[in-house]
C-alpha cells in the first residue's frame, strides 16, 4: 500500500514535469533506492545539478534568457571537479559562455544565481580577466588546458546551462 | 580633445588589398576597445570589426571574416585594418571609432572623420 | 541577425515643433532592465554622433531637446523642438547581439 501511494505521487509528480519537459532521465539513489533524481534528457547529470550544452551561437544575455526558458541559469561552477565534469563533454576548439559576468566593468564578478563569488576558487587563464570592457566569461581550451576568459558581451558564444536535480 | 585620424584609403581593383590606420589623440588609447564601420554610399551604416584593449580579442560580422584584419600598436596609439580580397560592395567610406560599454552591451562614443575606400577595375 | 527598421524614411517637421522617429527591432535587445539601443546622429559629410545610449540616457554635451524611449523591440527617438542645426539622418543601433546592425537611417528636414 505504502509502495501504491509513493508510485501514485511519483507519476502525478512527472505527469506535472512532463509540461515543461518532455522527456526525463532519472535515476533510483539514496540508502533505500527509493529517491529518484530526474534531469531532462538529454541533459547530463553531476552531483546534485543537471548540465545543458547550447550550441546556439548567442550573446551572453540571450544565452541566460535561453537557459532561463528551460528553468535554468548560465551555469555556475562551484569546485574544480565540477568544473572537470563539464569540460569531459566540450569541444576544444569552441568557447561557452559561464553564469559570471562583471556588468559596471569594476571588477565585481557575479554570478547569475548570487552564489558569492569566491576569487579562491576561480579557474581564469594565466593573465585573465585582462579588460573591463569585456564583461562576460567564458571557459575554452587555451595552453593545454580549460580555462576562463573575459569577452565582450555581445558576442555570440556556445554556453553551458545548468539547474537543480528534479527529485521526485 | 579626442581626434581620430584615418589614413590609407583609395582606389583599388578587385581582389587587391588596402591597409587602412587610425591614429588616436586625447585619449589613453591603450585601455579603449576601438572599432571599424563603414557606410557605403546611399546605404546605412556597417559594423566592420572590433579589437580589446589587449588587442588579443577581435571580432567580426561574416561578411568580411577571412578577408580583413584589424590590429593595434598601442606604443603608436595606432589602429589598422588590413582588407585583402576586396569586392566591389566593400567600397565604402571607414570610420574608426572608440568603444564605450554599457552593462551588457555598448555605444561608439567618438568616430573619426572618415576615409574612402573605392574598389572598381 | 537582429534587423532594426526605422519609420519613416523622411521627415519634414517646422522649427520648434516636434519630431518622432521610430526603430524596431527584430527581436527584444532587453536585458534586466536595459535595452541595448543606441541613436546616433549624422550630418552632411560628417561623421555619426552619439546622442541617446541604452534607449533612453542622454550623452553628455547633447541638447535635452533629445530624448529616448521604449524597451523590448520597440523605440523612439524624440527632438522636442526642432532647430535649424538639427536637419540630418538619425540612426538606430543594437548592441545587444553581434553583428552590431543599424537602421536603415531617417532623414529630418524643415518644412
Known amino acids: 500500500n505504502f509502495m501504491y501511494s509513493k508510485t501514485v505521487k511519483r507519476l502525478s509528480k512527472l505527469q506535472e514535469y512532463q509540461q515543461y519537459y518532455p522527456s526525463l532521465t532519472c535515476v533510483m539513489e539514496g540508502k533505500d533506492m527509493e529517491d529518484w533524481s530526474c534531469c531532462p534528457t538529454p541533459w547530463t547529470s553531476f552531483q546534485s545539478s543537471c548540465y545543458f550544452i547550447s550550441t546556439v551561437m548567442q550573446s551572453w544575455t540571450k544565452s541566460q534568457n535561453n537557459c532561463s526558458v528551460m528553468g535554468a541559469d548560465l551555469v555556475v561552477i562551484n569546485t574544480k571537479e565540477e568544473q572537470d565534469f563539464i569540460t569531459q563533454n566540450l569541444k576544444i576548439n569552441s568557447a561557452y559562455f559561464l553564469g559570471l559576468s562583471d556588468p559596471k566593468g569594476w571588477r565585481h564578478w557575479q554570478w547569475v544565481d548570487q552564489t558569492p563569488y569566491n576569487k579562491n576558487v576561480t579557474f581564469w587563464h594565466s593573465g585573465e580577466p585582462n579588460s573591463p570592457d569585456e564583461r562576460c566569461a567564458i571557459i575554452n581550451f587555451r595552453s593545454e588546458e580549460w580555462g576562463w576568459n573575459d569577452v565582450h558581451c555581445h558576442v555570440p558564444q556556445k554556453s553551458i546551462c545548468k539547474m537543480k536535480k528534479i527529485y521526485i | 580633445e579626442v581626434q581620430l585620424l584615418e589614413s590609407g584609403g583609395g582606389l583599388v581593383q578587385p581582389g587587391g588589398s588596402l591597409r587602412l590606420s587610425c591614429a588616436a589623440s586625447g585619449i589613453t588609447f591603450s585601455t579603449y576597445t576601438m572599432s571599424w564601420v563603414r557606410q557605403a554610399p546611399g546605404k546605412r551604416l556597417e559594423w566592420v570589426a572590433t579589437?580589446?584593449?589587449?588587442?588579443?580579442?577581435?571580432y567580426y560580422p561574416d561578411s568580411v571574416k577571412g578577408r580583413f584584419t584589424i590590429s593595434r600598436d598601442n606604443s603608436k596609439n595606432t589602429l589598422y585594418l588590413q582588407m585583402n580580397s576586396l569586392r566591389a560592395e566593400d567600397t565604402a567610406v571607414y570610420y574608426c571609432?572608440?568603444?564605450?560599454?554599457?552593462?551588457?552591451?555598448?555605444?561608439?562614443?567618438?568616430w573619426g572623420q572618415g576615409t574612402t575606400v573605392t574598389v572598381s577595375s | 541577425d537582429i534587423v532594426m527598421t526605422q519609420s519613416p524614411d523622411s521627415l519634414a517637421v517646422s522649427l520648434g515643433e516636434r519630431a518622432t522617429i521610430n526603430c524596431k527591432a527584430s527581436q527584444s535587445v532587453d536585458y534586466d532592465g536595459n535595452s541595448y539601443v543606441n541613436w546616433y546622429q549624422q550630418k552632411p559629410g560628417q561623421p555619426p554622433k552619439l546622442l541617446i545610449y541604452?534607449?533612453?540616457n542622454l550623452e553628455s554635451g547633447v541638447p535635452d531637446r533629445f530624448s529616448g524611449s521604449g524597451s523590448g523591440t520597440d523605440f523612439t527617438l524624440t527632438i522636442s523642438s526642432l532647430q535649424a542645426e538639427d536637419v540630418a539622418v538619425y540612426y538606430c543601433q543594437q548592441s545587444d547581439e553581434d553583428p552590431w546592425t543599424f537602421g536603415g537611417g531617417t532623414k529630418v528636414e524643415i518644412k
Open positions: 579589437i580589446n584593449s589587449g588587442g588579443d580579442n577581435t
Open positions: 571609432a572608440t568603444y564605450r560599454p554599457y552593462y551588457y552591451g555598448s555605444v561608439l562614443d567618438y
Open positions: 541604452g534607449a533612453s
